[in-house]
């Protein structure tokens, strides 16, 4: 039998919460490092491709260290939920010429809103200030061209990538703290 | 070719400190992380951390905290890692390798740079 | 820390035969559908160089007689048919968590 009505549910080990948070990151990452894997073979784009949509990386080392919990999961679900509504409107507005990238986008998006829900969750169990609701974004601009659209999938695909490693650098780091 | 290239051996005092190098050549040096390994004759490998090059950020294991520095020029695309406090243990090659971001694992690896203490 | 054990310790095989080398992890490495293996090559006096991440991948430019394979503890680095270069000593490496630790390697010799 469980525990009595109304007593408090056991806390989970916030340590484990992170562990398994930092893990679903990586898993994350993962996909994102062989999307962009292939993407660059499909469709080779040299330089740097920027979006001015995009967050701006988080956190420099030197704020890293001086991070707490809260900003850290605010922060990133903030990002994650604008690089989510980016690889939608990269689904929907490339949806053609990136035929060759599906199932893998798909899959993606998936494994990033389970992991924005993993981060409110965790957020809840932590007891942290839950967020307002965000204010509607406004909606991104249709790619200019094929080739517009593939230099924003770069763009898209190299700051989650950097923005997941910010991440498990930054949650490792406050999983010590603990 | 992607290559890392390392600094020439070094042979330390105990309580000295040493700086190895580690350059990187034919890749993009912002997309990887940079990671040190040591091995010490008849022990296992040893992961002392690593350092993303964009955010810097190194990540250490315990057991080098506090005596491992490990830092990037990004202009040069160079690595560095310092040992302080050195001791007969720290007898080893050390090497630096490239990984996969927040995966630790090594797909490119530098020659390796022997580090001698001994009084 | 995860303490991964290699066995056996060292393994005499001719030219042609097949070799077959595990990896013991102390808890499972396997999680969120990637398991956190690695196998590397080393050959005295040179860097380790990878062959297999993550479990199973075959890593760019290594042949395909190499193989991996297993999940939760347990892991395999199979090599179908031995060649003359194979022979060298072998370790596998976690990076489920921190810090990432190696095996005590396995060495392959010529019999």
């Known amino acids: 039998p469980g525990p009595p009505p109304g007593s408090p549910r056991a806390s989970p080990d916030p340590r484990a919460e992170l562990d398994s948070t930092v893990l679903l990151t990586r898993s994350l990452l993962e996909d994102t490092r062989q999307l962009t894997i292939q993407l660059k073979d499909k469709f080779p784009a040299d330089g740097d491709h920027n979006l001015d949509s995009l967050p701006t990386l988080a956190m420099s080392a030197g704020a890293l260290g001086a991070l707490q919990l809260p900003s850290v999961l605010t922060r990133l679900r903030a990002d994650l939920l604008s690089y989510l509504r980016h690889v939608q409107w990269l689904r929907r507005a490339m949806g053609s010429s990136l035929k060759t990238l599906e199932p893998e986008l798909g899959t993606l998006q998936t494994r990033l809103d389970r992991l924005l829900r993993r981060l409110q969750l965790l957020m809840s169990r932590l007891a942290l200030p839950q967020l307002p609701p965000d204010p509607p974004a406004p909606p991104l601009a249709p790619p200019s061209s094929t080739w517009g659209g593939i230099r924003a999938a770069h763009a898209i695909l190299g700051g989650l990538h950097l923005t997941l490693d910010w991440a498990v650098r930054g949650l490792l780091l406050l999983k010590t703290r603990l | 070719e992607v290559q890392l290239v390392q600094s020439g051996a070094e042979v330390k005092k105990p309580g000295a400190s040493v700086k190895i190098s580690c350059k990187a050549s034919?890749?993009?040096?912002?997309?990887?992380?940079m990671d040190w390994v040591k091995q010490a004759p008849g022990q296992r490998l040893e992961w002392i951390g690593d350092?993303?090059?964009?955010?810097?950020?190194?990540i250490y294991n315990q057991k080098f905290t506090g005596r491992a520095t490990l830092t990037v020029d990004k202009s040069a695309s160079t690595a560095y890692m310092e040992l302080s406090s050195l001791r007969s243990e720290d007898t080893a090659v050390y090497y630096c390798?490239?990984?996969?971001?927040?995966?630790?694992?090594?797909?490119?690896w530098g020659q390796g740079t022997t580090v001698t203490v001994s009084s | 820390d995860i303490v991964l054990t290699q066995s056996p310790a060292s393994l005499a095989l001719s030219p042609g035969e097949r070799a077959t080398l595990s990896c013991r992890a102390s808890?499972?490495?396997?999680?969120?559908?990637?398991?956190?293996i690695h196998w590397y090559q080393q050959k005295p006096g040179q860097a380790p160089r990878l062959l297999i991440y993550l479990a199973s991948n075959l890593e760019s430019g290594v042949p395909a007689r190499f193989s991996g394979s297993g999940s939760g503890t347990d892991f395999t680095l199979t090599i179908s048919s031995l060649e003359e270069e194979d022979f060298a000593t072998y370790y596998c490496q976690h990076s489920r968590d921190l810090p990432p630790t190696f095996g005590q390697g396995t060495k392959l010799e010529i019999k």
């Open positions: 350092i993303n090059p964009t955010i810097g950020a190194p």
């Open positions: 808890k499972s490495v396997s999680t969120e559908g990637y398991s956190y």
């Open positions: 034919g890749y993009i040096f912002r997309d990887y992380n």
């Open positions: 390798a490239r990984g996969a971001l927040a995966h630790w694992y090594f797909d490119v």
